[in-house]
Structure formats: C-alpha cells, structure tokens
Amino acid sequence: MMTGTIETTGNISAEKGGSIILQCHLSSTTAQVTQVNWEQQDQLLAICNADLGWHISPSFKDRVAPGPGLGLTLQSLTVNDTGEYFCIYHTYPDGTYTGRIFLEVLESSVAEHGARFQIP
C-alpha cells in the first residue's frame, strides 16, 4: 500500500539566463528510495540512483547539474525551458511516486526595464 506523499516547489518562475533548483521531497513512507528520475515532459533529464549515483542525459549535460540532494539544478535557462517537470521516486516496496513542478522562464528584469524605460 502506498502511504507516501510527494511535496514539490509547485509553480515557480525564473529569469532567462539564470538558474533554478527543482526539488521534491517524499514523506510519510518508510519505503526505500531506490532511484529518482527527473523529466521534462516525457524527456529524461537525469537519474539519481541510490547505488550508482547520478546520470545526466547526454543532451542536457551542459545545462543540468545534480543536486542539491535529490534535486536538480537547471542552468542557462531559456524561454523554451518553460513547462512541466516531473520528479519520479522509485521506491521499494511501495512503488512509484510522481511529483509535478511547473516552471515559467521570464525575460530578465534587465531586459524588461530596458524596454520600458528609455534613457533620454
């Protein structure tokens, strides 16, 4: 029986060119976390395996960093990074728990201010 719950950072926003930490936390279960997968939509970003450690998908190696903890850091954000992210906790014997985070990447405040306030 699955008794655990996933807590996530929910809906978050970050500036273009910046970085963001995606974090989830599994609570209310004594199940062993064997692996945590991070996905963007249906695309694998990274895996943190209890035994083997971190594996970052080759196509994201330049912009994804492991941690902190079981979280994931996205770097050099672009507006194309806007969307749903999923943390998938593989546990034994409970099964699989999934958490969802929505990230919105905004144009940087510098760019916004530059557009709004013209220097005479």
Partner: antibody
Framework: EVQLLESGGGLVQPGGSLRLSCAAS????????MSWVRQAPGKGLEWVSG????????YYADSVKGRFTISRDNSKNTLYLQMNSLRAEDTAVYYC????????????WGQGTLVTVSS | DIQMTQSPSSLSASVGDRVTITCRAG??????LNWYQQKPGKAPKLLIY???NLQSGVPSRFSGSGSGTDFTLTISSLQPEDFATYYC??????????FGGGTKVEIK
C-alpha cells in the same frame, strides 16, 4: 565481448533447493544492476528478482519472496540465486540479465538454465 | 503490480508486411516501456527502450511509440528473421518489473 553465462539448473524435488550462478565477463560488473527473469515452458517472461550494483539493495517478486535469495560477488563477477522450498510452478528457464539504471532496459541476457521441479 | 496487456497474442504476416503490436499498461507508466524480441530456444533481445529509443544494433525498421498507458511496436517491412515472439516490459515501477504476455509473429 559482453557475456552472461548461467549454470546450476537441473532436476529437483518439490521442497528442495538449488543455487543458480551467472558468470559475467566483458564489462564492469559492479556498475550494473542485475536481475533474474524466468520463463515457464511455453509461457511468457516473469521478472523474479533484482540486485543493485553494490549488492546493497535486493528486490523480489511476490511469488518468490521469502523462498529465493539473490546475491552477488563483485570480486568474482558472479550473480547468484539461492532457491529454497521449490514448487512445481518454479519450473522454468532462468535468465540472468543486466541493466544500467533500468530505464534503459535489460540490454544483455544470458542463454538461460533450466530448472525442473518434479517428483 | 502494474499489469501489462499485449494484443494480439499472435498474428500471421508475410515478408514485407507492416506489423503493429500494441501494449497497454494498467496505469500510466509515462514512457517507461521496453520491447524485446525472442526467437525459439533463445534468450530475449532488447529492441527498444523508453518507448521509442532504438537499442544499438537494432535495424531501423523497428520503431516504438506511445506514452501513458498505450504503446506500439511497429515493424515497417517484415523480414524473415523477424518471425519471433515480442514482449513489452514496464520499468516505471523499478525495481519491480513486469512483462506483457507476448505476441507471436508467425509466417502466413
């Protein structure tokens, strides 16, 4: 060449025991999770048990929990399956497989060893 | 356990035919679906991992698709060596893995 070679199968009476071995070669054994998958005669595939690369984590299908024990010796590049309290329904070909993070599937399989449980 | 249901259980086809095998999961497994080919008396062989990724060395006539609960394995032009049994397997509930019942592709 990457290879898995099972041994230890044979005929055993119900209630008896058997120990299967799987010798690995051609890859860094401790970097891979390993599993046992079985196939009863004329039937489909059934995952039986798995073990992490270090051997620190073990997992079992409900059908064998408490009767089978998976283990590995990374110094010998060998995977084991100790099968106790065997039943007729355990009759099958037992395959040893390797997985890298599971997400990528079971990419290497041994040739299998037949276990027959019969009186 | 996550139940995996394959259809059809068997099919007859001719060389050159386009063949489609489906696999349905009892709950959403996202894209955590692998396909294997098994020939009589031989061990299974990994064809496709994570729903649509072709395993190294597998001919491009094999392709996979799907997400959630419904998945498809397609052989674009059946070759003599493709007559075999095909199994789907979910890895969403890693480390507890389950297989579909298999689909036997026979010569018409």
């Amino acid at each position: 060449e990457v290879q898995l070679l099972e041994s230890g199968g044979g005929l055993v009476q119900p209630g008896g025991s058997l120990r299967l071995s799987c010798a690995a070669s051609g890859f860094m054994f401790s970097d891979y999770a390993m599993s046992w998958v079985r196939q009863a005669p004329g039937k489909g595939l059934e995952w039986v048990s798995g073990i992490s690369g270090s051997g620190g984590y073990t997992y079992y299908a409900d059908s064998v929990k408490g009767r089978f024990t998976i283990s590995r010796d990374n110094s010998k590049n060998t995977l084991y399956l100790q099968m106790n309290s065997l039943r007729a329904e355990d009759t099958a070909v037992y395959y040893c497989t390797r997985s890298w993070y599971y997400y990528y599937g079971m990419d290497v399989w041994g040739q299998g060893t037949l276990v027959t449980v019969s009186s | 356990d996550i139940q995996m249901t394959q259809s059809p259980s068997s099919l007859s086809a001719s060389v050159g035919d386009r063949v489609t095998i489906t696999c349905r999961a009892g709950q959403s497994i996202r894209s955590y679906l692998n396909w294997y080919q098994q020939k009589p008396g031989k061990a299974p062989k990994l064809l496709i991992y994570a729903s649509s990724n072709l395993q190294s060395g597998v001919p491009s006539r094999f392709s996979g698709s799907g997400s959630g609960t419904d998945f498809t394995l397609t052989i674009s032009s059946l070759q003599p060596e493709d007559f075999a049994t095909y199994y789907c397997q979910q890895s969403y509930s890693t480390p507890l893995l389950t297989f579909g019942g298999g689909t036997k592709v026979e010569i018409k």
